[in-house]
């Protein structure tokens, strides 16, 4: 039913299903080294892993997508693991007038689900 | 830069990149035939297709994910095509006391982006 609760135990084994993972990246990796001053190294939480049937379904659409993927796998893709929320990050920017604080509300994932 | 506009022309060829596609589904397909009376057939818009570098990036996180996927493809997955908005759908339900109308705000995708 559309009211089924999203499954929270991974049937594929530990670490295989949709989860948050930290990736270290430098400003050079991001192409930001010209205009971001600090930090030079970022801990970027990202959503990785598979989305087996009904695992952490984001909403009704994701549940239906999972079901139809089972019926028509060539036509309907499986849900995929994307951020459900973000943690704000504050970076120091170089500006014409000196240094500014800039907040990124959508840079680092805080939680993940299957959409 | 993080301020790059998300790309909107598909470099992979027509219909290959993230877009909205209509999938026909019956209530039987959805497992809803016991309790939804009408409509018996639904046009379910879903998000399908690939997310090449910076195509329809949902936000800064998606742009960064695309960039890091290019650098570390085994560690960072490519962004994937998910709904950016939904169209409400009204279904007629069978209830103990007769029939009710129920709105689903998150069943049918209205737009897609790469997240």
């Amino acid at each position: 039913s559309a009211h089924a609760h999203p499954r929270d135990s991974c049937p594929l084994g530990p670490g295989r299903c949709c989860h948050l993972e930290t990736v270290q990246a430098t400003l050079e990796d991001l192409g930001w080294s010209d205009w971001v001053l600090s930090p030079r190294q970022l801990q970027l939480s990202m959503c990785v892993g598979e989305c087996p049937h009904l695992y952490r379904s984001a909403n009704t659409h994701a549940q239906i997508k999972a079901r139809l993927h089972g019926l028509q796998p060539d036509k309907v893709p499986a849900p995929c693991c994307v951020p459900s929320s973000y943690t704000p990050v504050v970076l120091m920017h170089r500006t014409d007038s000196g240094v500014s604080l800039q907040t990124y509300d959508d840079l680092v994932a805080r939680g993940c689900h299957c959409a | 830069s993080a301020h790059a506009h998300p790309r909107d022309s598909c470099p992979l060829g027509p219909g290959r990149c993230c877009h909205l596609e209509t999938v026909q589904a019956t209530l039987e397909d959805l497992g809803w035939s016991d309790w939804v009376l009408s409509p018996r057939q639904l046009q379910l818009s879903m998000c399908v297709g690939e997310c090449p570098h910076l195509y329809r990036s949902a936000n800064t996180h998606a742009q960064i994910k695309a960039r890091l996927h290019g650098l570390q493809p085994d560690k960072v997955p490519a962004p994937c095509c998910v709904p950016s908005s939904y169209t409400p759908v009204v279904l007629m339900h069978r209830t103990d006391s007769g029939v009710s109308l129920q709105t689903y705000d998150d069943l049918v995708a209205r737009g897609c982006h790469c997240a």
């Epitope: 600090s38 930090p39 030079r40 504050v90 | -």
Partner: antibody, heavy 118, light 107 residues
């Protein structure tokens, strides 16, 4: 683990200068900036300014502009804060703080007491 | 500059009770607010950042809420080690500013 070790207490006369050091370890020094914060006896916390260890870019509190200079020595992973023309109301504990990507910081030095007295 | 105002200046609470500390910003700081705890002779300790995210190793009895100009730090059940001074700090704009502090003392 991240550690910030500051220089010892100082007693200075009004009009003199003081230079407080902050030696960092447990991380790549040039990856992060350093804030300086001070606290007068029995008072609250006052932000003094910030320096990036990578490029030496600084941003100072307006009220200290012209009297404060923040520098870094990347060869020794040490940050310095020099305050000139000291007055009695500069008497405070001075803290160095490593910046983080989240704004708030868990990484503080132990503090250096600077007493300005004639 | 953004002025951070904390209230009350002193809060007398019995161990085991709930403590609610307030912090008001003179203009919006979004969610760019941290809370620190400071005990006599020690450096401040980060409790909360991003208005509501607990720092590593901070017990669950500490929680933060609010955004914009009104923020709250709640200590659900005060332990003896929680009696200290608490500061809020905004990092939305230069200059970074702190509140005047709230002293939580034993009733």
């Amino acid at each position: 683990q991240v550690q910030l070790v500051q220089s010892g207490a100082e007693v200075k006369k009004p009009g003199a200068s003081v230079k407080v050091s902050c030696k960092a370890s447990g991380y790549t020094f040039t990856d992060y900036g350093i804030f300086w914060v001070r606290q007068a006896p029995g008072q609250g916390l006052e932000w003094m300014g910030w320096i990036t260890a990578y490029s030496g870019d600084t941003h100072y509190a307006q009220k200290l502009q012209g009297r404060v200079t923040m520098t870094t020595d990347t060869s020794t992973s040490t940050a310095y804060m020099e305050l000139r023309s000291l007055r009695s109301d500069d008497t405070a504990v001075y803290y160095c703080v490593r910046d983080t990507q989240y704004g708030g910081s868990p990484y503080w030095g132990q503090g250096t007491l600077v007493t300005v007295s004639s | 500059e953004i002025v951070m105002t904390q209230s009350p200046a002193t809060l007398s609470v019995s161990p085991g009770e709930r403590a609610t500390l307030s912090c008001r910003a003179s203009q919006s700081v979004s969610s760019n607010l941290a809370w620190y705890q400071q005990k006599p002779g020690q450096a401040p300790r980060l409790l909360i950042y991003g208005a509501s995210t607990r720092a590593t190793g901070i017990p669950a009895r500490f929680s933060g809420s609010g955004s914009g100009t009104e923020f709250t730090l709640t200590i659900s059940s005060l332990q003896s080690e929680d009696f200290a001074v608490y500061y809020c700090q905004q990092y939305n704009n230069w200059p970074i500013t702190f509140g005047g502090g709230t002293k939580v003392e034993i009733k």
